[in-house]
């Protein structure tokens, strides 16, 4: 959470002389309350924007916009404090709009914007606009807050930002997963243009449950340069457990720019559709189960096995 580096922060507009200042998030009016204070912002609107830094990086920023109520309290409005709180880390960043001239009513509702808070992909924020001076203790609140969830790097707008590209967002593995038979799964994906290894994580689930019944990890060695952008295929051996039929395949790359923290891509194979009509019951019931294929477990290593190929 930081401010966009190279921009001259401007808040002046026709009819108002205004300057933007860094803030400690503790305005003086908390310590020295005033008798007359302005009302709260009318509407806060927040959306995501992408801006470039002075180093040419593209970063996600919050665009914050708000309007004033059309009451007489604008005569006592001396500015505004904008605060962005990252919900998980409790990190807070504030700026202060300082009005250097008195506000007057004019034919349009006063509107303010600020687009300099740099945020992180896949993070949750609370944005607060506090009109200044802040109210006396037990006075009516004169702030408004809104939450905002920054999309993750899979979002089209975010993919091209520098933090997302660093974590491998431009790689589209175009995964296809195919069930060959009850015991084999074929995974195809496109390799990226980097000589780095990949890991395939297979998690299987029963038809209607979210707790796994089988997990397997498969390592794919780094491809040679002539294999970049080619399709790679892997055949994974499944654990032969009845009903363990929904398979989630996740591919984890280890690119040099993100190492263990690269974006993972996944694909899921659903269980086969259940037939609408029940299986017919045979006319006779055998007194014993045939020995072959009777076990729920494979005879070999039940951790699963696999082999892979790169296709040119």
């Amino acid at each position: 959470l930081r401010l966009l580096d190279h921009r001259a922060l401007v808040c002046s507009q026709p009819g108002l002389n205004c300057t933007v200042k860094n803030s400690t998030c503790l305005d003086d009016s908390w310590i020295h309350p005033r008798n007359l204070t302005p009302s709260s912002p009318k509407n806060i609107y927040i959306n995501l924007s992408v801006s470039s830094t002075q180093h040419g990086e593209l970063v996600p920023v919050l665009h914050v916009e708000w309007t004033l109520q059309t009451d007489a309290s604008i005569l006592y409005l001396e500015g505004a404090e904008l605060s962005v709180l990252q919900l998980n880390t409790n990190e807070r960043l504030c700026v202060r709009f300082e009005f250097l001239s008195k506000l007057r009513h004019h034919h349009r509702r006063w509107r303010f914007t600020f687009s300099h808070f740099v945020v992180d992909p896949d993070q949750e924020y609370e944005v607060t606009v506090h009109h200044l001076p802040k109210p006396i203790p037990d006075g009516d609140p004169n702030h408004q807050s809104k939450n905002f969830l920054v999309p993750d790097c899979e979002h089209a707008r975010m993919k091209v930002t520098t933090p997302c590209m660093s974590s491998g967002s431009l790689w589209d593995p175009n995964i296809t997963v195919e069930t060959l038979d009850t015991q084999h799964l074929r995974v195809d994906f496109t390799l990226w243009n980097e000589s780095t290894h990949y890991q395939i994580l297979l998690t299987s689930f029963p038809h209607m449950e979210n707790h796994s019944c089988f997990e397997h990890m498969h390592h794919i060695p780094a491809p040679r340069p002539e294999e970049f952008h080619q399709r790679s295929n892997v055949t994974l051996t499944l654990r032969n457990l009845k009903g363990c039929c929904r398979h989630q395949v996740q591919i984890q790359p280890f690119f040099s720019s993100c190492l263990n923290d690269c974006l993972r891509h996944s694909a899921t194979v659903s269980c086969p559709e259940m037939p609408d009509t029940p299986e017919p019951i045979p006319d006779y019931m055998p007194l014993w189960e045939p020995r072959s294929g009777s076990s729920d477990y494979k005879d070999d290593d039940d951790k699963g096995s696999s082999h892979h190929h790169h296709h040119h």
């Epitope: 919900l87 998980n88 880390t89 409790n90 949750e124 939450n147 969830l149 999309p151």
Partner: antibody, heavy 116, light 107 residues
Framework: QVQLVQSGAEVKKPGASVKVSCKAS????????ISWVRQAPGQGLEWMGW????????KYAQKFQGRVTMTTDTSTSTAYMELRSLRSDDTAVYYC?????????WGQGTLVTVSS | EIVMTQSPATLSVSPGERATLSCRAS??????LAWYQQKPGQAPRLLIY???TRATGIPARFSDNGSGTEFTLTISSLQSEDFAVYFC?????????FGGGTKVEIK
């Protein structure tokens, strides 16, 4: 694979307290907040609050303020929700979920029955 | 607090058909809306957030339209695993609030 595994069902008497645990795996607990949501039998979902395992910061729904405490133990990657002064209308399935706004992974739920 | 209202309470649809679920907020919530699916005896599962972004692993047949106060979840072609209860939830301001749910059942 991200998983949140909750403690087992509890039966409590009115006035008692209950403490539900939620063990996270497949990710670092401090990377995201943990929210708690409950669902009374046959009813909808009710948000109770959240805790940031990173900062310890909490936010509780006004309805539960003073009666609920959310904590985390990062050494065991576990979040806890304690609800005190239980009443019969606190009978519900209590869920923990990852994140604070849009809740992307949920525990399997813990049924808490309050009955005399 | 913001009140979320879902309609209809129950929706009867045949497999392969399109389902349209409605969610209304008592005041504008921009695009700060999430949709969840819940099957009997299971926890809810996040489908969509930001009113239109599908969560990881959610098929493209699930989509949302709307912003402000009116939202619509569309399931383009219902599969057998889609019959469940669907909840909307706003995260624009505290407290987070959920709609009462729409049950999608087999016609």
């Amino acid at each position: 694979q991200v998983q949140l595994v909750q403690s087992g069902a509890e039966v409590k008497k009115p006035g008692a307290s209950v403490k539900v645990s939620c063990k996270a795996s497949g990710y670092t607990l401090t990377s995201y907040g943990i929210s708690w949501v409950r669902q009374a039998p046959g009813q909808g979902l009710e948000w109770m609050g959240w805790i940031s395992a990173y900062s310890g910061n909490t936010k509780y729904a006004q309805k539960f303020q003073g009666r609920v405490t959310m904590t985390t133990d990062t050494s065991t990657s576990t979040a806890y929700m304690e609800l005190r002064s239980l009443r019969s209308d606190d009978t519900a399935v209590y869920y923990c979920a990852r994140r604070q706004l849009a809740l992307d992974y949920w525990g399997q739920g813990t049924l808490v029955t309050v009955s005399s | 607090e913001i009140v979320m209202t879902q309609s209809p309470a129950t929706l009867s649809v045949s497999p392969g058909e399109r389902a349209t679920l409605s969610c209304r907020a008592s005041q504008s919530i921009s695009s700060n809306l999430a949709w969840y699916q819940q099957k009997p005896g299971q926890a809810p599962r996040l489908l969509i957030y930001g009113a239109s972004t599908r969560a990881t692993g959610i098929p493209a047949r699930f989509s949302d339209n709307g912003s402000g106060t009116e939202f619509t979840l569309t399931i383009s072609s219902l599969q057998s695993e889609d019959f469940a209860v669907y909840f909307c939830q706003q995260y624009d301001t505290w407290p987070l609030t959920f709609g009462g749910g729409t049950k999608v059942e087999i016609k």
